[in-house]
């Protein structure tokens, strides 16, 4: 009878020990299994979860525009006054709804190449007005012409055309014209076959971005989605030195197992450069724990504040000998047009940049860019890309429309907020397939370990108690 009880207690302790050991073993084994599964599923090749979402994003992406409507155009042109602007928006378009095209796997170097078609569909229900709403904005062609043709003889010729076409420093254009293009009356007078269509994003619809060639991760998962080349080149040919490098991914995903200490590098063709994001905070996105990575102010700093940025300062006059910050001259990438990129409302820009403009209200929460990355898979499940398009306009003695200007202005034209968030259905699926399974496995591991340890300890205590009782 005593033996039966003792045997039973020992059996219970052994079972507990086995469960505890199994739970303990399951931890590294389970992690290994998860890692193996993740590594398999994030590879960019036919049949994987990542590939399906990569070819055509499951997220609805919107691009909202706010246009800076100039309130005092005549005063600026005549007296070189401060430019008073009032933002109007949002005007919302659906973008990135087209699947990647010309997808070609290269098994030799473990890459996949593709182009990303561009398209934009206006969403009236998410907009404050229609595409026919009018705005007073800088005359893009008039501002750009003397910058492209700094030759004084040609400026005299251009002045004749500007006067003949009755163009001036500012113009009134509809949203549709401003964004997607309009036939410019001044350029239409140039008696040579040049492109006479002007628009902030012209040409956009029916164009493609790329060719991109990215690592598929088959041989090395830590390189998955990292851009190997863009438009057939490993460099951009826009910037001197290392600033010209194409670093990281396209920000839609990153190699898996993202750590908070990691700097996420990515290339954005919109700003013609590679940039980076650093860990900001942990947030819960529809029940999925994600890391919010933010673009630091340091990325837009002057070379004085951040010496790494010295090669992004390509001209000395407007940048006050590279002391100004918060604006990026991307003219080299825009056929020599005087295009400057910044954060909305000149957030994180030096006071000299925003001083000639009235009506700007930079706000960290509304105007910063962030990426919400699920750390296990490296997928970006939510993002907000915010940037502002500005045009430099300078005094030009030979051009009457610009001859009264006493200083250069970096004139804000519009800012955009491109956002995407994983849908509820997709989030549920993601939780079931990824975070849910990981949570469940973690719970099983802890339960086995916990129950095993409790059983072992309880049965061992009972056994010892029984033994000492019998001994007496």
């Amino acid at each position: 009878m005593g033996c039966d009880r003792n045997c039973g207690l020992i059996a219970g302790a052994v079972i507990g020990a086995v469960l505890a050991v199994f739970g303990g073993i399951l931890m590294p084994v389970g992690d290994m299994l998860i890692e193996k599964t993740i590594k398999r599923e994030v590879v960019l090749e036919e049949g994987t979860t990542a590939f399906k979402n990569w070819v055509k994003t499951g997220t609805t992406v919107y691009r909202q525009f706010w246009i800076f409507d100039v309130q005092n155009p005549d005063d600026v042109a005549k007296n070189s006054s401060k430019i008073k602007v009032k933002q109007r928006g949002p005007y919302t378009y659906r973008v990135r709804y087209l699947a990647k095209e010309n997808i070609t796997q290269d098994p030799e170097d473990h890459t996949v190449s593709f182009v990303q078609p561009n398209g934009a569909i206006f969403e009236p229900s998410l907009s404050v007005g229609t595409e026919d709403d009018n705005f007073t904005v800088l005359n893009l062609a008039v501002a750009a012409a003397p910058h492209i043709y700094q030759n004084s003889f040609v400026q005299v010729v251009l002045n004749s055309l500007i006067k003949k076409s009755k163009s001036s420093m500012f113009q009134t254009r509809s949203l549709k014209e401003l964004l997607w293009g309009y036939k410019d009356p001044f350029l239409s007078l140039v008696p040579y076959p040049i492109s006479t269509t002007v628009g902030v994003f012209y040409p956009y619809n029916d164009t493609v971005d790329g060719v991109y060639k990215v690592f598929n991760g088959k041989d090395n998962i830590s390189k998955v989605a990292i851009i190997e080349s863009y438009k057939g080149k490993r460099n951009l040919s826009y910037w001197p030195s290392y600033c010209d490098m194409i670093n990281g991914t396209d920000a839609a995903s990153f190699p898996p197992f993202v750590e908070k200490s990691r700097t996420l590098r990515f290339f954005s063709s919109d700003i013609c450069r590679s940039i980076y994001a650093v860990f900001g905070s942990e947030i819960d996105l529809k029940g999925i724990p994600v890391y919010r990575f933010v673009l630091p102010a340091n990325a837009f700093a002057s070379p004085l504040q951040n010496p790494d940025n010295h090669c992004f300062c390509t001209e000395k006059v407007i940048s006050n000998n590279c002391t100004s910050y918060g604006v990026l001259d991307i003219g080299k990438c825009k056929e020599g047009k005087p295009v400057y990129i910044s954060l909305p409302h000149f957030l994180h820009a030096s006071p000299d940049v925003s001083e000639p403009i009235e009506g700007l209200h930079p706000n960290e929460d509304e105007h910063r860019t962030y990426l919400d990355v699920e750390p296990i898979t490296g997928f970006t499940l939510q993002f907000a890309k915010r940037l502002q398009v500005n045009i430099l306009v300078k005094p030009a003695r030979k051009i009457e429309a610009l001859k009264n200007l006493k200083r250069p202005y970096i004139v804000p034209i519009l800012w955009l907020n491109e956002t995407g968030t994983i849908g509820d259905e997709k989030a549920e699926m993601f939780k079931t397939q990824v975070t849910g399974k990981i949570k469940l496995l973690g719970m099983v591991e802890m339960a086995l370990l916990g129950i095993g340890v409790v059983m072992f300890v309880a049965f061992m205590i009972s056994y010892c108690a029984c033994k000492s009782k019998n001994g007496k």
Epitope: Q150, N151, S152, F153, V154, V156, V157, N159, S160, L161, K163, K164, L189, V190, P191, Y192
Partner: antibody, heavy 117, light 107 residues
Framework: EVQLVESGGGLVQPGGSLRLSCAAS????????IHWVRQAPGKGLEWVAW????????YYADSVKGRFTISADTSKNTAYLQMNSLRAEDTAVYYC??????????WGQGTLVTVSS | DIQMTQSPSSLSASVGDRVTITCRAS??????VAWYQQKPGKAPKLLIS???SLYSGVPSRFSGSGSGTDFTLTISSLQPEDFATYYC?????????FGQGTKVEIK
């Protein structure tokens, strides 16, 4: 086909006047603007005057300023150079030429102006 | 005014020779330089604009180079029809100015 044909040259006494014409075909002179360039016998080329596109401003070499006037009749697609107070040093072959960006892609055959007593 | 100084003022060469004519601007004219060929009794003909851009119909043996203040016209292999006077011209600032010319003669 683009063509420029000058006329109106000849012998004139010092202090006299002459009006040169430049008839254009194959393009619209108002879109481009027209220049007059001269070449004294055995010498190099000298830019004389220019009328900017669309009846824009007129520009002259210092040596002819106040004496020469450039004009255009868009209905006739013809440019003119009115030369007053002519001097011996104005003796030259006068060419009209088309230009937009400042280089001359088409030239006329030239017309000789001789200023002599 | 911008002065354009051409050198040499004349040169003798044989058919098949490589000929180089230089032109110096008195101030920076970027790439706004044109080159012309003129034969006796004829109007000049445009060869090159924007310092390096070959005008349509001009044989590829003609080439231009340079930027800023120093410019060069090169004829890679001189042909019988190339014996003429060559002029450079800046089209950066009014008044437009020409070099004094370089006469290429048969050796």
């Amino acid at each position: 086909e683009v063509q420029l044909v000058e006329s109106g040259g000849g012998l004139v006494q010092p202090g006299g006047s002459l009006r040169l014409s430049c008839a254009a075909s194959g393009f619209t002179i108002s879109s481009f603007g027209i220049h007059w360039v001269r070449q004294a016998p055995g010498k190099g080329l000298e830019w004389v005057a220019w009328i900017a596109p669309y009846g824009g401003d007129e520009y002259y070499a210092d040596s002819v300023k106040g004496r020469f006037t450039i004009s255009a009749d868009t209905s006739k697609n013809t440019a003119y150079l009115q030369m007053n107070s002519l001097r011996a040093e104005d003796t030259a072959v006068y060419y009209c030429a088309r230009s937009f960006f400042g280089y001359f892609d088409y030239w006329g055959q030239g017309t000789l102006v001789t200023v002599s007593s | 005014d911008i002065q354009m100084t051409q050198s040499p003022s004349s040169l003798s060469a044989s058919v098949g020779d490589r000929v180089t004519i230089t032109c110096r601007a008195s101030q920076d004219v970027s790439n706004w330089v044109a080159w012309y060929q003129q034969k006796p009794g004829k109007a000049p003909k445009l060869l090159i604009s924007y310092a390096t851009s070959l005008y349509s119909g001009v044989p590829s043996r003609f080439s231009g180079s340079g930027s800023g203040t120093d410019f060069t016209l090169t004829i890679s292999s001189l042909q019988p029809e190339d014996f003429a006077t060559y002029y450079c011209q800046q089209h950066s600032n009014a008044p437009l100015t020409f070099g004094q010319g370089t006469k290429v003669e048969i050796k």
